[in-house]
Amino acid sequence: PEPPTACREKQYLINSQCCSLCQPGQKLVSDCTEFTETECLPCGESEFLDTWNRETHCHQHKYCDPNLGLRVQQKGTSETDTICTCEEGWHCTSEACESCVLHRSCSPGFGVKQIATGVSDTICEPCPVGFFSNVSSAFEKCHPWTSCETKDLVVQQAGTNKTDVVCGPQDRLRA
């Protein structure tokens, strides 16, 4: 018979013959022959291969370096890589999450619109009229000004985006 020029899915052509690829989690030890199947071996601990392959070496799992603020989010298996994320209060600097930076704080006059996650930074927004923030924080939203009326008081000092209103007693009309 004619030697094949192409092979089926999950096979590869070598020495004019179709051999089975190794399944994910295994590496190639020896190609098949006319008389033997492809020989594959499982990846060792801390190694993986995530595709049908003919690799002779497995990939090393990613190392989540604590010196870069990283920790393991999902432990790798023989078929998957380790996924790193950042320690509490930090977020990844890139999609690949190779290092971390501290979450930004929102300055006075700004409040937190969206609290940071392991992969995204804090999103701040300016405090609108009627709201204020007098602290630098990665968690605090803008607070509404105190309502003097509900306390039967009057505004003695107007509020700003950084300060609350100051309430005081109503002036008594003298007789």
Epitope: D50, T51, Q74, T80, D81, S94, E95
Partner: nanobody
């Protein structure tokens, strides 16, 4: 859950170019490989190109090698397929696919991808 939205398809003359885009939303995919597949009328879906996240390794089907280029923009969560020197036999619906988190290698088999877009039509006229 990941949503994938392809764009950039259309009608083009043989020898022309198109650039397909696939925007991912719902989850960052920076640690996952991405690929493009295509399906012509009455044919099986076939692998076109893939890109991994370890050093941006790429794989191409023999039929598109030297004509198509796959790339990503992680900041925009987008994968691109630049298609040059198009031929009538490139006519198909092109779908992008993403592997799950922890699968960084470019893969050529459909069952190694976890999320799929709806597809965009590419028609090459002679």
């Amino acid at each position: 859950q990941v949503q994938l939205q392809e764009s950039g398809g259309g009608l083009v003359q043989a020898g022309g170019s198109l650039r397909l885009s696939c925007a991912a939303s719902g989850r960052t995919f920076g640690r996952s490989a991405m690929g493009w597949f295509r399906q012509a009328p009455g044919k099986e879906r076939e692998f076109v190109a893939a890109i991994g996240t370890r050093g941006g390794s790429t794989k191409y089907a023999d039929s598109v090698k030297g004509r198509f280029t796959i790339s990503t923009d992680n900041a925009k969560n987008t994968v691109y397929l630049q298609m040059d020197s198009l031929k009538p036999e490139d006519t198909a619906v092109y779908r992008c696919a993403v592997r799950g988190p922890g699968y960084p290698s470019a893969a050529i088999f459909q069952d190694e991808y976890h999320y799929w877009g709806q597809g965009t039509q590419v028609t090459v006229s002679s």
